[in-house]
Interface confidence: medium
């Protein structure tokens, strides 16, 4: 005769793909101390069991490795581990406690796995500020995945120069040396859990700290266009009385702080401009002479120069004799 | 849809062996096993004994030990059941039949269309 | 083994008629009893399951009731169609074993 018992707890569990549940099951306390057998978890419906301790007994191909019977009859417990969990194990379950030497077996009652979709993501974690050309470590962190699933497989892709660091069942370190160019460039990790095939991944914009590499003027004369002066310039030739507009532009990140300078200042001397835009609005005797541009950023400093030669006004000069 | 489709039947002579099969189809075969039954004719049924598709491992009815030897073919999602030193006693018909396993029963949900196996010099 | 009794051997009715069928277990097997119906040159067939309940598919006249050892099938009106061998399957104690089994016929 068949004796039945309820699992205690829950009458369902929610599991995501690829992670891991403990069913819960203990042994009916009517259960005989002297009570010798062997248990079995079975999937509702289907003859062949998903887990068992019964060395006889072959178990369901699909859970083979997955599901494990945490069998200890001493502490009555009978509980159903699920690593890697698929949506094919989304379904209700049943354990049974057989004896080849009592009469009776007991069942238990159902309970229902519910596997849903994977909805954690990695987590990417940056120490500090990414500077170009020194090395930082960067770590991809599945905190979620539980240490006796598969472990997982970790990818990164990046067009920064990288190295792989070291790895445990739920991280991995990728050292990176960024370059100016990849600054605001994607860096993704992708995780694949192979026990179940679910691929997840998380990509962040690197934010790459990095001196200026270029500076550049662009000169804006009366109405006519614009031109722009890419390095030192030993002379530009400028009417009395023009109105000059000139426009210092640099790379870096963050963004370098721009000044401009009468002559080629020292370290320490008082800027003309505080920002990247110098106005003459009537280039005289004054004005004739070097003007530089300073991009100034924690990370090094770079500046160009320009050197305006003032054509006079025929008529001016026959007024001054 | 769940299927079992046996194969056709055998007229063979007393002594010798037969083999006949059970293709399944509309499920996962390793989730069950496969249930062969005995029906003589006009007379009730019998359960010879059963196999597991994931191993092979059989569990039989003391009567048919060293009378029905069961295989699987996984690849092929196939149940074999040999029977030898067949008697006019062996001639049936043979059922392949899969067992719904639940937590409150047990009970043959799909049946095979069955053999008819003739056993006569 | 546990041996299943069914009786009678053959029943004979009229269409339209209530008819029961009878299994008998050797021994207590609480609601562990299955019903088939085979009809001639078929397959077995799951009329009812687990002592009393039914089956999806198959026609609502059909119904079982019992428990321990005694088992009744009823067809509370029969049709021509219902003209089989009736069965009984025991799933209480290894090794399974199936009754004699009991022939329908219509008057």
């Known amino acids: 005769q068949e004796r039945r018992f309820q699992l205690e707890g829950p009458e369902s569990l929610t599991v995501q793909e690829g992670l891991c549940v403990l069913v819960p099951c203990r042994l009916p306390t009517t259960l005989p101390a002297s009570y010798y057998g062997y248990g079995y978890w079975f999937l509702e419906g289907a003859d062949v069991p998903v887990a068992t301790n019964d060395p006889d007994e072959e178990v369901q191909e699909e859970t083979r490795g997955r599901f494990h019977l945490l069998w200890d009859p001493r502490r009555k417990n009978c509980s159903l581990s699920i690593r890697d969990a698929r949506r094919r194990d989304n379904a209700a379950y049943f354990f049974r406690l057989k004896s080849k030497w009592m009469k009776y077996g007991y069942t238990s009652s159902k309970l229902s796995v519910r596997v849903m979709a994977l909805t954690h993501r990695p987590n990417i974690s940056i120490p500090g500020t990414l500077e170009s050309g020194h090395p930082s470590n960067l770590t991809c962190s599945v905190p979620w995945v539980c240490e006796q699933g598969t472990p997982p497989i970790f990818s990164w892709m990046s067009a920064a120069p990288t190295s792989l660091g070291p790895r445990t069942t739920q991280s991995s370190v990728l050292t990176i040396t960024p370059r100016p160019q990849d600054h605001s460039t994607n860096l993704t990790c992708q995780v694949t859990f192979p026990g179940a095939g679910v691929t997840m991944e998380r990509t962040i914009q690197l934010n790459v700290s990095y001196a200026p590499q270029k500076v550049a003027i662009s000169i804006f004369q009366g109405n006519s266009a614009a031109f722009k002066i890419l390095q030192n310039t030993s002379s530009l030739p400028v009417l009395e009385g023009q109105a000059l507009r000139l426009l210092c532009d640099a790379d870096g990140n963050p963004p370098a702080h721009l000044s401009w300078f009468q002559g080629f200042p020292a370290l320490n001397a008082t800027p003309i401009s505080n920002t990247g835009v110098l106005e003459l609005p009537q280039v005289g005797s004054a004005e004739e002479g070097d003007f530089t541009c300073r991009a100034q950023h924690p990370l090094g400093s770079l500046q160009i120069s320009l050197s305006l030669f003032v054509h006079w006004k025929p008529e001016g000069r026959a007024g001054g004799v | 849809e769940v299927q079992l489709q046996q194969s056709g039947p055998e007229l063979v002579k007393p002594g010798a062996s037969v083999k006949m099969s059970c293709k399944a189809s509309?499920?996962?075969?390793?989730?069950?096993?496969m249930h062969w039954v005995k029906q003589s004719h006009g007379k009730s049924l019998e359960w010879i004994g059963n196999?597991?598709?994931?191993?092979?491992?059989?569990s039989y009815n003391q009567k048919f030990k060293g009378k029905a030897t069961l295989t699987v073919n996984k690849s092929s999602s196939t149940a074999y059941m040999e029977l030898r030193s067949l008697t006019s006693e062996d001639s049936a018909v043979y059922y392949c039949?899969?067992?719904?396993?639940?937590?409150?029963?047990?009970?043959?949900?799909?049946w095979g269309q069955g053999t008819t196996l003739t056993v006569s010099s | 083994d546990i041996l299943l009794t069914q009786s009678p051997a053959i029943l004979s009715v009229s269409p339209g008629e209530r008819v029961s069928f009878s299994c008998r277990a050797s021994?207590?097997?609480?609601?562990?009893i299955h019903w088939y119906q085979q009809r001639t040159n078929g397959s077995p067939r799951l009329l009812i399951k687990?002592?009393?309940e039914s089956i999806s598919g198959i026609p609502s006249r059909f119904s079982g009731s019992g428990s321990g050892t005694d088992f009744t099938l009823s067809i509370n009106s029969v049709e021509s169609e219902d003209i089989a061998d009736y069965y009984c399957?025991?799933?209480?104690?290894?090794?399974?074993?199936f009754g004699g089994g009991t022939k329908l016929e219509i008057k």
């Open positions: 039949a899969r067992r719904y396993y639940g937590s409150s029963s047990s009970y043959f949900d799909y």
């Open positions: 509309g499920y996962t075969f390793t989730d069950y096993k």
């Open positions: 196999i597991n598709p994931n191993n092979g491992g059989t």
């Open positions: 021994q207590s097997i609480g609601t562990s």
């Open positions: 687990y002592a009393s």
């Open positions: 399957q025991q799933s209480n104690s290894w090794p399974t074993t």
